[in-house]
């Protein structure tokens, strides 16, 4: 008996073939010999069936012996035998429905588990296989889960279920409400203006929740919070905001904030957490701050970096279209008696410059 | 909702090949066939072919000796290929779904043959 | 093939006005015809279909009869969304037919 898979709420086609190339008369029954369809002359007849509003079947084809039974919108309760009888034979074809679909909503926040429910009928004793869109492989039977979701879980999920070495491929939507970055970092030279952005992973027809961006200064002793916004529908509004520094933020997404200057006060890292409405848990993106300054009083040349900085990082003064440079591994080096000319402080990353800073020394006489 | 997006080169020369793909979202293409129609002032509407799921091909036999439907069952897309088109094969060229009748259709894709 | 001719080719009428639009085939197809309506710039849209079913958010105003070679669509009272084109098709075998349409004007 030849087994067919079908897709809940999809459409399949049980085909019924005549070894004749031509209109012939033939019927369709279930398990219980109740009648689905027929033909009666040219007709298509329904019979007392459960599915006869959803089976149908392709006239054009008869003419080549073709008698397939369309079944519309599946249930898994038509899983069941069916029987095509045509020619005084009977093909018996039978027909598993499943289902797969996602415990809780398909829109999740980053950590959160998933579960994945597979609906099927009785009797059957399916494996279920998913991968993810970056290539994760999960198997499992009736439940598959997913402990925690990471950003490139987001995508569409394809899921195979296996029954009689015949299969079934499902497609599940999955979009992990996350920040792009997990962590990002600004660096800036004293007094210049410092811009944070936070873009979305995702999008949201309606994105409304409330956030909040705590930041703990270097040189402080205890982090706080420095602005307070709503989201509603995609629009940002501010609803509290510390007096130094006195920040900015963007009215429309992606979140974004401005401090009008990069002071070594500042230097430091954030944590903007984003709760949206009608989920549990909330979106989180650190941001670090890294401020440089290069001073010169009397016959010391002096640059320093605040903020949070890797140990690898080099920093280096360093005379132009001169050799004379100094460098350290360190957050601050300084050159006595320096020479004229103009100088360049370098903050640098095995040789890429992540911020550098001017500084003039003029001749003393 | 099932609804189909179609897409394709506009203008040809006579004696090219026209590509056109067309992508089912909102459902499956299991079950049912897939078919392309085409409409022109001078012929009015007619059907140019069909495919399935499985690549089960049926064809209008006046233009079969030039037609090539296909099927992406991974994308969720069938396209048609129409080989050595003349200024006759000027039409609007519609994707759509057929049990035995059409529905729903794509919005149309416009493509002239011309020198 | 199957030829399937539409009449008349064009009608004018009024808002309000019962119109009845005919098709005929050249071979008994039974009930295995359709009727699609299509406006200026748009794909068809299928109305009726099985001679007489009609297709799920079609106004009740359409109505579809006939079985054999000869069928007719009606419209009961006419709206002003119901003036465009109207084709017959056929499902009977293939290839699949279509009339070649019935222009219907504003009077």
């Known amino acids: 008996k030849k087994v067919v898979l079908g897709k809940k709420g999809d459409t399949v086609e049980l085909t019924c073939n005549a070894s004749q190339k031509k209109n012939t008369q033939f019927h369709w029954k279930n398990s219980n010999q109740i009648k689905i369809l027929g033909i009666q002359g040219l007709f298509l007849t329904k019979g007392p069936s459960k599915l006869s509003d959803r089976a149908d079947s392709r006239k054009s084809l008869w003419d080549q012996g073709c008698f397939s039974m369309i079944i519309k919108n599946l249930k898994i309760e038509d899983s069941d035998t069916y029987i095509c009888e045509v020619e005084n034979k009977k093909e018996e074809v039978e027909l598993l429905v499943f289902g797969l679909t996602a415990n809780s909503d398909t829109h999740l926040l980053e950590g959160q588990s998933l579960t994945l429910t597979l609906e099927s009928p009785p009797g059957s004793s399916p494996s279920v296989k998913c991968r993810s869109p970056g290539g994760k492989n999960i198997q499992g039977g009736r439940t598959i889960s997913v402990p925690q979701l990471e950003r490139q879980d987001s995508g569409t999920w394809t899921c195979t279920v296996s029954q009689d070495q015949k299969t079934v491929e499902f497609k599940i939507d999955i979009v992990v409400l996350a920040f792009q970055k997990a962590s990002s970092t600004v660096y800036k030279k004293e007094g210049e203006q410092v811009e944070f952005s936070f873009p979305l992973a995702f999008t949201l027809e309606k994105l409304t929740g409330s956030g909040e961006l705590w930041w703990q200064a270097e040189r402080a002793s205890s982090s706080k919070s420095w602005i307070t916004f709503d989201l509603k529908n995609k629009e940002v509004s501010v609803k509290r905001v510390t007096q130094d520094p006195k920040l900015q933020m963007g009215k429309k997404l992606p979140l974004h904030l401005t401090l009008p200057q990069a002071l070594p006060q500042y230097a430091g890292s954030g944590n903007l957490t984003l709760a949206l409405e009608a989920k549990t848990g909330k979106l989180h993106q650190e941001v670090n701050l890294v401020v440089m300054r290069a001073t010169q009083f009397q016959e010391n040349l002096t640059c320093e970096v605040w903020g949070p900085t890797s140990p690898k990082l080099t920093l280096s003064l360093k005379l132009e279209n001169k050799g004379a440079t100094v460098s350290k591994q360190a957050k601050a080096v300084w050159v006595l008696n320096p020479e004229a000319g103009m100088w360049q402080c370098l903050l640098s990353d095995s040789g890429q410059v992540l911020l550098e800073s001017n500084i003039k020394v003029v001749p003393t006489w | 909702q099932v609804q189909l997006q179609q897409w394709g080169a506009g203008l040809l020369k006579p004696s090219e090949t026209l590509s056109l793909t067309c992508a089912v979202y909102?459902?499956?293409?299991?079950?049912?066939?897939w078919s392309w129609i085409r409409q022109s002032p001078g012929k009015g509407l007619e059907w140019i072919g069909e495919?399935?799921?499985?690549?089960?091909?049926n064809y209008n036999p006046s233009l079969k000796s030039r037609v090539t439907i296909s099927v992406d069952t991974s994308k969720d897309q069938f396209s048609l290929r129409l080989t050595s088109v003349t200024a006759a094969d000027t039409a609007v060229y519609y994707c759509?779904?057929?049990?035995?009748?059409?529905?729903?259709w794509g919005r149309g894709t416009l493509v002239t043959v011309s020198s | 093939d199957i030829q399937m001719t539409q009449s008349p080719s064009s009608v004018s009428a009024s808002v309000g006005d019962r119109v009845t639009l005919t098709c005929r085939a050249s071979?008994?197809?039974?009930?295995?015809l359709a009727w699609y309506q299509q406006k200026p710039g748009k794909a068809p849209k299928l109305l009726i279909y099985?001679?007489?079913s009609l297709q799920s958010g079609v106004p009740s105003r359409f109505s579809g009869s006939g079985s054999g070679t000869d069928f007719t669509l009606t419209i009961s009272s006419l709206q002003t969304e119901d003036f465009a084109t109207y084709y017959c098709?056929?499902?009977?075998?293939?290839?699949?037919?279509f009339g070649q349409g019935t222009k219907l004007e504003i009077k």
């Open positions: 099985a001679a007489s």
């Open positions: 909102g459902g499956s293409l299991s079950g049912y066939y």
């Open positions: 071979q008994d197809i039974s009930n295995w």
């Open positions: 495919i399935n799921q499985s690549g089960s091909t």
């Open positions: 098709q056929q499902a009977n075998s293939f290839p699949y037919t």
């Open positions: 759509t779904r057929v049990l035995n009748w059409f529905d729903p």
